[in-house]
Amino acid sequence: ATKLTEEKYELKEGQTLDVKCDYTLEKFASSQKAWQIIRDGEMPKTLACTERPSKNSHPVQVGRIILEDYHDHGLLRVRMVNLQVEDSGLYQCVIYQPPKEPHMLFDRIRLVVTKGFSGTPGSNENSTQNVYKIPPTTTKALCPLYTSPRTVTQAPPKSTADVSTPDSEINLTNVTDIIRVPVFN
């Protein structure tokens, strides 16, 4: 099995984790994709997933997690906004490909969230606080109940993450077609 690598990210409470998970464009463009947390001694748990089939550049929000699948670019963007200390943990992007096991995208993300001042949410007319004011919509995307394996035989492309600038402007208040999905334990 391929050695699983991780990248560590130390962020402050209130900041945003912004992850790029890239994949083989032709093969996985419309496949359903998911963001998972891996807790010690447990199988990966799916926190959020895209629709099936995955829609291009179509935001899907589950609580503080926002997924966007850029089909044109072979890239899944994952954001976790307003980070909390309890969000600390190991995360990964996967591609669902039933009936086969999910396809894991390297690297895993080791997120460490610490308490502390992370700057003002933003001085622009639309600050990062607005990201939570999203109109309720019909639930469309359902995450498969099965979880992904702990190992994988081939190494797919890497994923990376970063924190948004504190004074960034994120305005999702006028987005009426964001999909909110339930979380499966």
Partner: antibody
């Protein structure tokens, strides 16, 4: 042909304002993030701001926050940079660039010169 | 923000030389690095993306390598058209982007 053409540069006094435009053609403008990058005379490249496809996210370099505003009009295939409270250090060639998340800045305009001087 | 350090700032070389430019990131950027070429009075041109992928239309004498924090741009056999300034840029997240300070490749 994929093309970006900037306009709106010129000479402006410190504290003044200027609005740069970038006309896009040859590709689906509404499918791409877009960026502004500047280059002061004899200096290196500095990323200034970028904007998501639908305009819902905008990011700025620290030195222009609160003074510059990036915007777009997808119906007109146009990108804009409103620059207020201009300073001498904002003097530069301003480039509009297509922002492809896998590739980086893969298409650039020819640039427009902004000179801030009294 | 992620800082990008490029070296050398100036490089004197002759046609046919093998040229290597390095770029170091202040933190891991995986493979999210691009290299650009810029000639005086012109806009930058994308050469390499994802650290090692050659942009369409770029001559194969250009190559990129590295991941994490250390990256290299190599020109296997310098041609007259290659005398220019080269910049690295990280695009690990959707913002902010940062460029290296540039490397001017001049005629020896």
């Amino acid at each position: 042909e994929v093309q970006l053409v900037e306009s709106g540069g010129g000479l402006v006094q410190p504290g003044g304002s200027l609005r740069l435009s970038c006309a896009a053609s040859g590709f689906t403008f509404s499918s791409y993030w877009m960026s502004w990058v500047r280059q002061a005379p004899g200096k290196g490249l500095e990323w200034v701001a970028n904007i998501k496809q639908d305009g819902s996210e905008k990011y700025y370099v620290d030195s222009v926050k609160g003074r510059f505003t990036i915007s777009r009009d997808n119906a007109k295939n146009s990108l804009y940079l409103q620059m207020n409270s201009l300073r001498a250090e904002d003097t530069a060639v301003y480039y509009c660039a297509r922002d492809a998340p896998q590739l980086g800045l893969d298409v650039w305009g020819q640039g427009t010169m902004v000179t801030v001087s009294s | 923000d992620i800082q990008m350090t490029q070296s050398p700032s100036t490089l004197s070389a002759s046609v046919g030389d093998r040229v290597t430019i390095t770029c170091r990131a202040s933190q891991s950027i995986s493979s999210w690095l691009a290299w650009y070429q810029q000639k005086p009075g012109k806009a930058p041109k994308l050469l390499i993306y994802k650290a090692s992928s050659l942009e369409s239309g770029v001559p194969s004498r250009f190559s990129g390598s590295g991941s994490g924090t250390e990256f290299t741009l190599t020109i296997s056999s310098l041609q007259p058209d290659d005398f220019a300034t080269y910049y690295c840029q990280q695009y690990k997240s959707f913002s902010p982007f940062t460029f290296g300070g540039g490397t001017k490749v001049e005629i020896k």
